[in-house]
Structure formats: structure tokens, C-alpha cells
Amino acid sequence: QRKRRNTIHEFKKSAKTTLIKIDPALKIKTKKVNTADQCANRCTRNKGLPFTCKAFVFDKARKQCLWFPFNSMSSGVKKEFGHEFDLYENKDYIRNCIIGKGRSYKGTVSITKSGIKCQPWSSMIPHEHSFLPSSYRGKDLQENYCRNPRGEEGGPWCFTSNPEVRYEVCDIPQCSEVECMTCNGESYRGLMDHTESGKICQRWDHQTPHRHKFLPERYPDKGFDDNYCRNPDGQPRPWCYTLDPHTRWEYCAIKTCADNTMNDTDVPLETTECIQGQGEGYRGTVNTIWNGIPCQRWDSQYPHEHDMTPENFKCKDLRENYCRNPDGSESPWCFTTDPNIRVGYCSQIPNCDMSHGQDCYRGNGKNYMGNLSQTRSGLTCSMWDKNMEDLHRHIFWEPDASKLNENYCRNPDDDAHGPWCYTGNPLIPWDYCPISRCEGDTTPTIVNLDHPVISCAKTKQLRVVNGIPTRTNIGWMVSLRYRNKHICGGSLIKESWVLTARQCFPSRDLKDYEAWLGIHDVHGRGDEKCKQVLNVSQLVYGPEGSDLVLMKLARPAVLDDFVSTIDLPNYGCTIPEKTSCSVYGWGYTGLINYDGLLRVAHLYIMGNEKCSQHHRGKVTLNESEICAGAEKIGSGPCEGDYGGPLVCEQHKMRMVLGVIVPGRGCAIPNRPGIFVRVAYYAKWIHKIILTYKVPQS
């Protein structure tokens, strides 16, 4: 099946991306060619290359190939954005699972099933052997990585560094075990690239051997990356076109996730009385078609046989005989009980009257010219001309007055989070408006997030499960108390302001809350001399979806030896991968007899793409999130740590780079934590601090 022209299917494509070598010792090879397929063939066969090719870049403008002996995960390399470049990485080198017997596995696992470190293939100590890299060209017998050069039954193996154990298999999972989907896999964005019978999938951006309509550029939201299995058309499960000219398409063997819940982003807005959009989220009980003919039950095959069963279309709520839209039709429908009428639309269900019409904005909304004049909390906007003095106070250029008409929501200060307005309410001087970004608008609000263009430091100077006790320089750490109980952490970023998480406020009554500062013990034992107890006077909720809250203290904290503020990072900055950071908290520790002391766990920053891989492709991180993995297995934040900081150091300056929010379980081995990226919200924080009145000390 593996003909020369098809080798491009063995590569993962990253559009508009190239690799820059920071380490000058790394080699590359270039040549003029016509197509990316030609680059792929040469990389796969290593023809005329002085190294093992792991990736290549196709320069579309110059029609040039750049072949690399490294990929984006190698050290001494960084990714860079470039319109004319497409990066292709050999999947065998970036997969962390095996297909079949793992003959093609070229990953970096180097520990055996029982935990013994592997012996390097080029070494004869402690075991002599004939598996020399020179004898097995193309099998990548590099370093001491697990390999299966002869395609033997047990999968990848290695000689061990233990003289008592000659060789042992490595515990590398099958890709079909690692990959899983929810519902019928419409939201599946994993890396399975072969069908249930083992056929390699055809790339979605190719029309050979099978012509098809599912072009990635035509369906940007369907996840048509490379040749991965997808379900763009409401099939019972993901599938792909195959490279076998005689088999047009086949289903893929992807199991259902044990945690079979959909991400919020995957779920259409559920309605019961009316239809939103095409009605895919309609969950009402209308059970006749437009002309009154009753619907057939979804779990029945009479009078019409069909495969739209509740079993085949999980999560589509095919209950009873209610009208539904499980397959992306134009509106909810059903099979009818009339043997002569197979299906009918339930067009009598009214359309939801969308509030504010179809109002939306593109990018960050700086060009929004709609006529909404109300904040998200329902306050009426006040006239722009009455607020120009305040506006000038926090922007350093002349706003476009022609746009600031009446009291309409606008974005004159280039706010990353969309249109807003002044309110005339002294407690809430301004707030965002309830307008969403236009559907399908993917304009980033921060450009080039993954490249360390902007330094995070301004100047050059959790449960934390299994964490260790800490006492030094943590004066910014806040214990938020709810009815006498520690509920969350927080960071003192200004004398009157604490940065914390939205989930920390079960009650709306601010009298139920206190902020404890200067403590080390969760109950304040032994901290009497340094403890400051402050009431909470206001909660300012972050931009929509941020999970952040700025908590205003009733009076400013007194900064002393035990209470201090922590710095914020520069807006839109990126902290380099592998930077060592820490999370702090008084939350769940897993200890039977917890001493009540603040604990710290050490984590390291991980790029969003790699982080997503560690989450088995089940989460796609965006520009508002930051990821950090544990240095010590099984340590990380948990309940009681939420709201607390992820603290990193750059240029000898400590900053709060992330905020702990409830995630997908606590301290799961090899599952890095996902935090709110403070750098993405830094302008919002500064704007609040600048514009909200605080009591004077």
C-alpha cells in the first residue's frame, strides 16, 4: 500500500510554520522542488541526505525543500510563523503510541515495562548484542530508545542497563488504546490515521486516490488535519478515505472515552422551546412534523428502517419520538409514523428570538459599529462624550471620536476582550458588553503566542498534592475564607486587589468572605503577629470565559515583612518552554495528617501543542491558557488551591503567570495542569486597577 507518491501521509502538517535552529551545530539540507510530496518522498527514503530526516519545510514561495534531522520537539530548535512555509513532521518521531507491533515506532521512551533504564544500542555494556545502528539502517536505533527493528510480537523493546535482565519490552500503548472519542466523535480531534482494518488514511487535502468534497479550506471547523480520522457528516463514528484505491472509505477504531462528557465548546446551545441556528441543540418535546403527522420513535424500525438510533447517535438525545437534528440537517426532523412519508421537518417549532439580533464583532471589536448600549450586567451605557477625560487617562493616543457616537458599545482602547462602555455607576465605572465574536472568526487577539517575542518580566531585576512546605517570600499569597473556612487561594497584586478564580464564590453575599494575608498556616495558628484579615468590598469578574475575578479589599493591605504584592507579566508575553515555575496552595494534599502549612509544587512550562498531546488530544488550548507539567509525578494543584498562582521567575523577577482553576482531575501523572494565562488578561487587570476607585489607607 505504501507507494512512493503516498509518503506525505506519514507526516503531520503545520501550516504557515517553519523551524529555526538555535543550535548552529544542527545540519539542514535544501533543494528546489515543485511539490511537498517530492520533499516527503526524499525525507522518507533519506535519499541523498547526510542524516536521518525527521521533518521538512516546504517553502511555497521559493518552491524549495528544507530537510531537517530534528523536529519541533527537539532541543536547539524553535517554531516560527511564516506565510510561505509549511512544516511537515514525520509522525513516527512525534507519536507516543504504537501501531500494530510498533515496527515504525521512533519515539523517545527509554524505560522498560518494569521501569529499568534501556542500554544504548551503540553500547555493548552490560549486554553484548548484534543490533548495531549500522546494521539496522532506517530502524532508528538511536540513543537508548525502545525499538522493534524486526517487528517482533511483544512490541518495542530494548536491552536493559541491568546486567541481570538482558532485554525487556517497553510499556508503550497502542494508538487505538490511547485515542478515544465522545459521543459519535464529531468533536474528535485526535491523531488516529488508519482505519479499523489497518488501511492508511488519505490526506484530507489530497484528491488521490479518491476525489471528495471535504476540503480543509472549505470546512475550517471540521479539523481536517493531515490524514486523521474525522466525523464531519454525522456518521456513527469517525472515518477516513483510504489509500487503497479499491476501498473509498472506512471507519476508524476509536474507542469511547471513559469520561464520556462533551467539552462545553462542542455542545450546541441547548433549547427546549425554540430553534437556535439549525436546531442541533433542540431538546424540546415537539413530536409531530409540520403538518401534524406524529413522529416514529427513534429506537423503532417501524414503519421506516434507519440507522439513526440512540446507540449510533449518542449525545444527540434521540429520546422517545421527539423532533431532533442529529445529522446537521437544516432543522429538527423525524421519521414519521405514516408508511408513505419517510421523514418530515418540524418547521412549526419557532426560531429563538436572538437577543441583540445577530450582533457580533471581529478580532477584538475595535471596528465594531453596532448599536448595543448595555453592559453584560444589564447596566445602561453612559455617553462617550461625558467620559472622554477618563478615557484619556488610560490610553496614550487620541481616540477616533467619529466612532464614539451616543452611548454605543465600542473599543476605543484596543481592549483584547471586545467592546465595552462606561456605565455612570461609580462602583462599576465600565464593563464589557454582551456581544460575542463572530462565528468562525479566528483572528488571534495576541499574535505569535508560541514565540518568545515579548519578555514577561517588566525589568531585569495547589492541593498542592505531594508538595513540600514553604515559608520564603510568599507574602503575596492570600487565603480566601468563606464562612470561616479556607476556600481558595489568591494573589495580592496591589494593596487593594487580589487576583483569584470565579469558582471561589459560592455565595453572592460578600459578608461571607474574608481575605487572610501574611499567614503560613491555613488556620492562622502561629501567624497572629503577621496575619491581616480584610473584608471583601467588590468582585470584578473577568472577561467572558476567563474564569478570573479581581477581588477588591475593603481597605488596602499594609505591606510589611509578611505581606507583599506580586508582579504581573507583560501583556501577551510568552514564558519559554521548560521554565521552572511553582504553584502554591492550602488545598487537598493527599496526606492523612496534613499540618496545615502552605505547600508548593514545582512545575515546568509546556507549550500548548505538546500539552494538548499529553491530554491525548482531548483538549485544545487557546491563547488564554498556559500549561505546566509536574517535575515530581503526582504533584500539582487540587481542590482548595483554586484561585492561587502559578509563579514563574524571569530575569530574577517573580510573576504570577497563571491562575489555578478547576480542571480535569488533580495531579494525574503525565497530565499537565492547565491554568488561566495571566499575560493574556494583563491589560484588563491594569485597566481595572486604574479605573476602579479603591479606599485610601
Epitope: R483, P506, S507, V522, I592, C638, E639, P662, R664, G665
Partner: antibody, heavy 120, light 107 residues
Framework: EVQLVQSGAEVKKPGASVKVSCKVS????????IEWVRQAPGKGLEWIGE????????NYNEKFKGKATMTADTSTDTAYMELSSLRSEDTAVYYC?????????????WGQGTLVTVSS | DIVMTQSPSSLSASVGDRVTITCKAS??????VSWYQQKPGKAPKLLIY???NRYTGVPDRFSGSGSGTDFTLTISSLQPEDFATYYC?????????FGQGTKLEIK
């Protein structure tokens, strides 16, 4: 080993009071909240309230304010709950459980339960 | 008060079956949900905390998921000792409340 040992079963007349004890061992008593829960015969679990032994701070379910009073003695590592003005509907098994040191924690160790029967 | 509605209220299954119990909260409780197992005449035992974290010593056939208002306890392959009553409980809003229980019986 963490243990919560409760006092024995009690039979009381309507209008009387009863004091249930919960002696803990195996961890620092003062640092974790003690939760009190009741379970009427054949019914589900109902939260009564909680106490932090180290400070004496309490939080009650509104339904049990005036009915239950929680105290703790850190010298003997024992928590107490007194129920007053007993009525037949107070017949239940009363459990103490170890809560966490923070709000919203789950309850990892439970006493064996004390059956309180109210009957004339 | 937040109402925790468990379903089903009773369930018959066989050893080796996969069983799912759901719990719906009347308001958002984030991930502050625990699952407990109770056998007749005994105190409840903690299985899952924080909606999805398995408590120490609990077999890995038990798993929890969910956030917000919808939560699930799954037993992947029933063992004889798993027949009991299961309760979900929320610790996000006073007063703490529990579901009415799901009695798991042998088929």
C-alpha cells in the same frame, strides 16, 4: 490509623435531649472540620453541620439551628453534638465524619454511627 | 438549597457489567462533588472527590466525571462487593446536600 469512634445507641423520650460523642485518633484533631450527618431509617443522608475543633467555629444547616449544638474538646480529641427537644422524626443514625481543612472538601473517614431512637 | 437528583434510584446488574449512575445538581456546583458507597448497617465510604479524583485505595474500576451540573459515577466492571447504595454529595454551597441514593442490586 485514622479512627472516629462514636458513642453507643440511645433511646429517648419525646422532648428529651441527647448528646452524641465522636472520639478521633490518628490525626491532628484541631486541624480538620468535623461534619455531622444523619440518616433516617431507609432514607438518604442529610447534613446537620460542622465544627472546626481548633477554633470552635461552626456552620449549621438552617434546618437544624436550634435543634443541634456542636462542641469539641481538644484535650480529649472528642467532638460532641447535642440534640434537643427530640421528636419521633429525629429517630435516625447520626454519623460524624472527618471533613477537610478547606471548604468543599469530601469526607474521608466516618464514625460507625449512633442510632438515636425517639419513642414514647 | 441545591437539590442533587440521582438516577436511576435503583438498578439491577450482573457481575462484569458496566454501570453508570448520574447526578444532576439544580445549580452549578463546579467540581465540588463526591461519591460515596454505603452498605447496609455501615457508614458511607468515600470513592470519588472533586468529581473525578479516585480516593486512595479505591479500585480503578470506579471513575467519576462531570462539572457544573451534570456528574457521573461509572463502575467499569461490577464485582460482587460493589452491590451497595451509592450517594453523590455537593460541597459547593451551604447547606451541603446529597442525592437520594442509587441502590445497586444483583440481577
Amino acid at each position: 490509623e485514622v479512627q472516629l469512634v462514636q458513642s453507643g445507641a440511645e433511646v429517648k423520650k419525646p422532648g428529651a435531649s441527647v448528646k452524641v460523642s465522636c472520639k478521633v485518633s490518628g490525626y491532628t484533631f484541631s486541624g480538620n472540620w468535623i461534619e455531622w450527618v444523619r440518616q433516617a431509617p431507609g432514607k438518604g443522608l442529610e447534613w446537620i453541620g460542622e465544627i472546626l475543633p481548633g477554633s470552635g467555629n461552626t456552620n449549621y444547616n438552617e434546618k437544624f439551628k436550634g435543634k443541634a449544638t456542636m462542641t469539641a474538646d481538644t484535650s480529649t480529641d472528642t467532638a460532641y453534638m447535642e440534640l434537643s427537644s427530640l421528636r419521633s422524626e429525629d429517630t435516625a443514625v447520626y454519623y460524624c465524619a472527618r471533613g477537610g481543612h478547606y471548604y468543599g472538601s469530601s469526607w474521608d473517614y466516618w464514625g460507625q454511627g449512633t442510632l438515636v431512637t425517639v419513642s414514647s | 438549597d441545591i437539590v442533587m437528583t440521582q438516577s436511576p434510584s435503583s438498578l439491577s446488574a450482573s457481575v462484569g457489567d458496566r454501570v453508570t449512575i448520574t447526578c444532576k445538581a439544580s445549580e452549578n456546583v463546579v467540581t465540588y462533588v463526591s461519591w460515596y458507597q454505603q452498605k447496609p448497617g455501615k457508614a458511607p465510604k468515600l470513592l470519588i472527590y472533586g468529581a473525578s479524583n479516585r480516593y486512595t485505595g479505591v479500585p480503578d474500576r470506579f471513575s467519576g466525571s462531570g462539572s457544573g451540573t451534570d456528574f457521573t459515577l461509572t463502575i467499569s466492571s461490577l464485582q460482587p462487593e460493589d452491590f451497595a447504595t451509592y450517594y453523590c454529595g455537593q460541597g459547593y454551597s451551604y447547606p451541603y446536600t446529597f442525592g437520594q441514593g442509587t441502590k445497586l442490586e444483583i440481577k
